[in-house]
C-alpha cells in the first residue's frame, strides 16, 4: 500500500534571467527511493538514479544543474520556462509518486512588485 506523500514548493514565481530551485520531498513512507525524474510537461529534463547518479538531458545541460539534494536548479530563466514541472519518485516497494510544481517566470519589474505585496 502506498502511504507516502509528496510535498512540493507548489506554485512559484521567479524573475526572467534568474534561477530557481525546484524541490520535492517524499514523506510518510519507509520506501527506498531508487530514482527521481524531473519533467517539464512531456520533456525529461533530468534523472537522479540511486546507483548511477545524475544525468541531465543534453538539450538542457547549459541551463539545468543537479541539486540541491534530489532537487533541480533552473538557470537563465526565460518566459518560455513558465509551466508545470513534475518530480517523479520511483520507490521500492511502493512504486511511483508524482509531485507538481507550477513555475511562472515574470519580467523583472513584475516579479519585484509581486514580492512586495502586503496583507492589509
Amino acid at each position: 500500500m502506498m502511504t507516502g506523500t509528496i510535498e512540493t514548493t507548489g506554485n512559484i514565481s521567479a524573475e526572467k534571467g534568474g534561477s530557481i530551485i525546484l524541490q520535492c520531498h517524499l514523506s510518510s513512507t519507509t520506501a527506498q527511493v531508487t530514482q527521481v525524474n524531473w519533467e517539464q510537461q512531456d520533456q525529461l529534463l533530468a534523472i537522479c538514479n540511486a546507483d548511477l547518479g545524475w544525468h541531465i538531458s543534453p538539450s538542457f545541460k547549459d541551463r539545468v544543474a543537479p541539486g540541491p539534494g534530489l532537487g533541480l536548479t533552473l538557470q537563465s530563466l526565460t518566459v518560455n520556462d513558465t509551466g508545470e514541472y513534475f518530480c517523479i519518485y520511483h520507490t521500492y516497494p511502493d512504486g511511483t509518486y508524482t509531485g507538481r510544481i507550477f513555475l511562472e517566470v515574470l519580467e523583472s519589474s513584475v516579479a519585484e512588485h509581486g514580492a512586495r505585496f502586503q496583507i492589509p
Epitope: 534523472i47 538514479n49 548511477l52 544525468h55 538531458s57 545541460k61
Partner: antibody
Framework: DVQLQESGPGMVKPSQSLSLTCTAT?????????WHWIRHFPGKKLEWMGF???????VYNPSLKGRISITHDTSKNRFFLKLNSVTPEDTATYFC??????????WGTGTTVTVSS | DIQMTQSPASLSASVGETVTITCRTS??????LAWYQQKQGNSPQLLVH???TLAEGVPSRFSGSGSGTQFSLKISNLQPEDFGSYYC?????????FGAGTKLELK
C-alpha cells in the same frame, strides 16, 4: 553525424592490461551524454562495463571494480578503457557507445580483442 | 543485479509475418527498457527506449510494450532487413544488463 571509432591492440597476453581508445567525431564529448564501454563475448552475451561523464566522473560495473578504469582526453575528443589483469575470459569485441539516460543511441564499430599467450 | 530473461532464444519467420520477442526482468524496472537490433558483423542499433519510444529513423512496424517486469517487442510485416539478433537492456540501475538475445532467422 556522431561517429565513434574504437582502436587498440587486437591481442593481449594474460595478466597484462588491455587499453582501448574511442575517438568521437561530429560531437563534443563535453557537450552532455555519458560515454560507455560495452563488450560482446563470443557466445552472444553483451556486458556493460562502465561510463565516464562529460565532467570526468565515472561509474563502473561492480563485477569489474578494481580492474577497470575509464578516462578521457577532452582536447582530442576521445575516451579510454583500461582493464587490468586480463584472462582469456576477457576475449570479446569491445564497443564504445554514447549514453542518453543510460541507453545507448550511438555505437562504435567495435574492435576484437583476444587474450592469449 | 537485475536479471534479464529473453525469449525465445531463436525464431524462424517469413517476410510479411508478425513476430513478438519477450523480455522478463527479475525486479520492477518501471518503463526503463530498451531494445537493440544487431546484424552479423555490425554493432547493435537502438530500436526502442523507455519501453515504447521508437529511436530516430526506426520504422513504425516495430513497437514496444510492457511495464514493471514484463516487456515485448513486436515486429509486424517482417522485411528482409529485419533478420538478425535482438537484445533487451534495462536502463534503470547499476549494473546495466542485457538479455541473452533472440536470433531471428528467415524461414
Amino acid at each position: 553525424d556522431v561517429q565513434l571509432q574504437e582502436s587498440g591492440p587486437g591481442m593481449v597476453k594474460p595478466s597484462q592490461s588491455l587499453s582501448l581508445t574511442c575517438t568521437a567525431t561530429g560531437y563534443s564529448i563535453t557537450s552532455g551524454y555519458d560515454w560507455h564501454w560495452i563488450r560482446h563475448f563470443p557466445g552472444k552475451k553483451l556486458e556493460w562495463m562502465g561510463f565516464i561523464r562529460d565532467s570526468g566522473s565515472t561509474v563502473y560495473n561492480p563485477s569489474l571494480k578494481g580492474r577497470i578504469s575509464i578516462t578521457h582526453d577532452t582536447s582530442k575528443n576521445r575516451f579510454f578503457l583500461k582493464l587490468n589483469s586480463v584472462t582469456p575470459e576477457d576475449t570479446a569485441t569491445y564497443f564504445c557507445a554514447r549514453g542518453l539516460f543510460w541507453y545507448f543511441d550511438v555505437w562504435g564499430t567495435g574492435t576484437t580483442v583476444t587474450v592469449s599467450s | 543485479d537485475i536479471q534479464m530473461t529473453q525469449s525465445p532464444a531463436s525464431l524462424s519467420a517469413s517476410v510479411g509475418e508478425t513476430v513478438t520477442i519477450t523480455c522478463r526482468t527479475s525486479e520492477n524496472i518501471f518503463s526503463y527498457l530498451a531494445w537493440y537490433q544487431q546484424k552479423q558483423g555490425n554493432s547493435p542499433q537502438l530500436l526502442v527506449h523507455n519501453t515504447k519510444t521508437l529511436a530516430e529513423g526506426v520504422p513504425s512496424r516495430f513497437s514496444g510494450s510492457g511495464s514493471g517486469t514484463q516487456f515485448s517487442l513486436k515486429i509486424s510485416n517482417l522485411q528482409p532487413e529485419d533478420f538478425g539478433s535482438y537484445y533487451c537492456q534495462h536502463h534503470y540501475g547499476n549494473p546495466l544488463t542485457f538479455g541473452a538475445g533472440t536470433k531471428l532467422e528467415l524461414k
